[in-house]
């Protein structure tokens, strides 16, 4: 069989390197020549957010688009051409792709004219040696026998909260089987919570590396001075510019009445452990906080009668239910909430490449936050999922 790079998948002069896929098989990574980027270097960077300059080299937005601001003595789109040696093609330079196992090459001005920044789990001058404690690509199975009995019991057991244990059978990930299942790059689940930009994990499939690669990262939160105010004034029909930011939930689109809706595919379905009437009483706060977490606009999906699709969620009957309880009807212990994601402002913002294209990717992100214990949301969520729009309506 052809090795992945033999099919020359990288466009526009991008360099193909072999890397290990999530299932342990061989896959490829393209190292693109600016201004190209993407899985196969098929996209053209239009902002510094999209341009991958070598580590340590800043990006500069110019009238002709973004470019890497090369240090003195280096030039070229990736700053890999030494001005002293126009070819820049000494065997030891970055042009020869000396860094192995997905490491990035940083040109330097002293011999050997490069420095490797290695991927997690690798070290050495060319990232050729596994580091002292190589990170296991993924635990193949759940190591603790006890976890098997605990999975699916609606309790997040921290000792079972690992990929191998399926995030305690979904108990720790809002019942999302594997939030990172679409992510090609290894270890992104480990890097999700490190507050550092990991470019290999910044794709939509890898849940945008928890927004670590965007200005201010995920630490850019709604100003606490504004937060209560923004919840009170969310979707109140009055444009509050202080709340009209992605981290404050876009003011419930109060400032976007002239902008056409851009709905993500599908419906985001949440099970919240609050009965419908209680949830609806604080729906502005609920939607504002969730919009702020997802950095886009959320709203209730409406049924044919124009009513918000918030349905009672009943306690699953264990069979040993008392006769009195059965006569009263099933106990309502929560709400099933159907939400639409409106990306109209997310896609208009300067960093418009981190919007959730569909409800399932938003569900995966919420599941990932929950799995790494970073879901700062005061409403008790039981599970979350994306459903296609054609899903039959609940009566």
């Amino acid at each position: 069989a052809l090795s992945p790079c033999e099919s020359q998948p990288c466009q526009h002069g991008g360099q193909c390197r072999h890397s290990l896929g999530r299932g342990g098989g061989l896959t490829f990574t393209c190292h693109c020549v600016p201004p190209f980027w993407g899985l196969r270097c098929e996209r053209v960077a239009r902002s510094c957010r999209e341009l991958q300059c070598p580590v340590g080299i800043p990006c500069q937005q110019t009238a002709r688009g973004p470019r890497c601001a090369c240090p003195p003595g280096l030039s070229g789109p990736s700053c890999r051409v030494s001005r002293a040696s126009p070819s820049g093609a000494t065997n030891a330079s970055c042009a020869s792709a000396p860094c192995l196992h997905g490491g990035s090459c940083l040109p330097v001005q002293s011999v050997p004219f490069f420095r490797c920044v290695c991927a997690p789990g690798w070290g050495g001058p060319r990232c050729e040696t596994p580091s002292a404690a190589p990170e296991v690509p993924e635990e193949p199975r759940c190591p603790r026998a006890a976890c098997q009995a605990k999975r699916g019991d609606q309790n997040c057991d921290r000792e079972c909260n690992t990929p191998g244990c399926g995030w305690d059978g979904g108990d720790c990930s809002l019942n999302v089987d594997d939030p990172w299942r679409q992510c090609e790059a290894l270890q992104c689940w480990r890097l999700f919570n490190n507050s550092r930009c990991d470019p290999a994990c910044s794709s939509p499939a890898c849940l945008y590396d928890n927004f670590d690669c965007y200005s201010g990262g995920r630490d850019r939160t709604c100003n606490p001075v504004y937060e209560k105010y923004c919840a009170d004034h969310f979707a109140d029909g009055r444009c509050d510019q202080g709340c009209n930011t992605e981290e404050c939930g876009w003011d419930g689109l109060d400032c976007a009445s002239e902008v056409p809706a851009l709905l993500a595919r599908g419906v985001l379905v949440l099970t919240v452990l609050l009965p419908p009437e209680e949830l609806l009483r604080s729906s502005a706060d609920f939607l504002q906080r969730l919009s702020a977490i997802l950095r886009t606009s959320l709203r209730f999906r409406l049924d044919a009668r124009g009513q918000a699709m918030v349905f009672p969620y009943h306690r699953p009957s264990p069979g040993s239910e008392s006769r009195v309880r059965r006569e009263l009807g099933p106990e309502v212990i929560g709400s099933v909430v159907m939400l639409e994601i409106d990306n109209r402002l997310c896609l208009q913002s300067a960093e418009n490449d981190h919007c959730f294209p569909d409800a399932q990717s938003a569900a995966d992100y919420l599941g990932a936050l929950s799995a790494v214990e970073r879901l700062d949301f005061p409403y008790p969520l039981r599970d979350v999922r994306g459903e296609p729009l054609e899903a039959p309506e609940q009566s």
Epitope: G237, G252, R281, S283, A284, A308
Partner: antibody, heavy 119, light 107 residues
Framework: QVQLVESGGGLVKPGGSLRLSCAAS????????MHWVRQAPGKGLEWVGR??????????DYAAPVKGRFTISRDDSKNTLYLQMNSLKTEDTAVYYC??????????WGQGTLVTVSS | DIQMTQSPSSLSASVGDRVTITCRAS??????LNWYQQKPGKAPKLLIY???NLQSGVPSRFSGSGSGTDFTLTISSLQPEDFATYYC?????????FGQGTKVEIK
């Protein structure tokens, strides 16, 4: 053109009930926050309450003097806003206006409907 | 609740006069203040929103200023059609509240 027309006002005894309607036309009613404002004869304006769009839960807020007695609702299929007034008092006598809220504020008001509470 | 206090409660002025009406909030409302004009038997009409923004279609002789607790509505040169009652209103927090009104009469 954009229009709001209130109806349902009239004479009612103290303790009685009345339901006001506000028919909207010329705009997508379902997406707007709607308000009720009243004005007692010869007096100033008093905010009664508001209702958000159903896409945000149709949350209502009320002024203290009417809380627990008045209920604001909406029927988006009929493009109509309602004010259900129970346990009416003489001090509820006023012209009641419905108004549309948006980013540039309540730019559309109805002509008002008079409610008289008297024995 | 936030109390809104307008002054004066009434004033007499002539055509061409410069008229100033003030409004004070019992607590800071940032710039969340609107000014309305109302003529007898008519619905109120919005003049100024967010303290200083002129609503479209409103003549430029009307202007608003202030933030925090103290606000001003100014009519630079009073016209015959400006004789009316003017109300300030805060929409910083529910319940939204109006000032008691200022009646501008012909001298």
């Amino acid at each position: 053109q954009v229009q709001l027309v209130e109806s349902g006002g009239g004479l009612v005894k103290p303790g009685g009930s009345l339901r006001l309607s506000c028919a909207a036309s010329g705009f997508t009613f379902s997406t707007y926050v709607m308000h009720w404002v009243r004005q007692a004869p010869g007096k100033g304006l008093e905010w009664v309450g508001r209702i958000r769009s159903n896409t945000y839960g149709g949350i209502t807020d009320y002024a203290a003097p009417v809380k627990g007695r008045f209920t604001i609702s909406r029927d988006d299929s009929k493009n109509t806003l309602y004010l259900q007034m129970n346990s009416l008092k003489t001090e509820d006598t006023a012209v009641y206006y419905c108004a549309r809220a948006e980013a540039r504020y309540r730019d559309v008001w109805g002509q008002g409907t008079l409610v008289t509470v008297s024995s | 609740d936030i109390q809104m206090t307008q002054s004066p409660s009434s004033l007499s002025a002539s055509v061409g006069d410069r008229v100033t009406i003030t409004c004070r909030a019992s607590q800071s409302i940032s710039s969340h203040l609107n000014w309305y004009q109302q003529k007898p038997g008519k619905a109120p009409k919005l003049l100024i929103y967010a303290a200083s923004n002129l609503q479209s279609g409103v003549p430029s002789r009307f202007s608003g200023s202030g933030s925090g607790t103290d606000f001003t509505l100014t009519i630079s040169s009073l016209q015959p059609e400006d004789f009316a009652t003017y109300y300030c209103q805060q929409d910083y927090h529910t319940p939204f509240t109006f000032g008691q009104g200022t009646k501008v009469e012909i001298k």
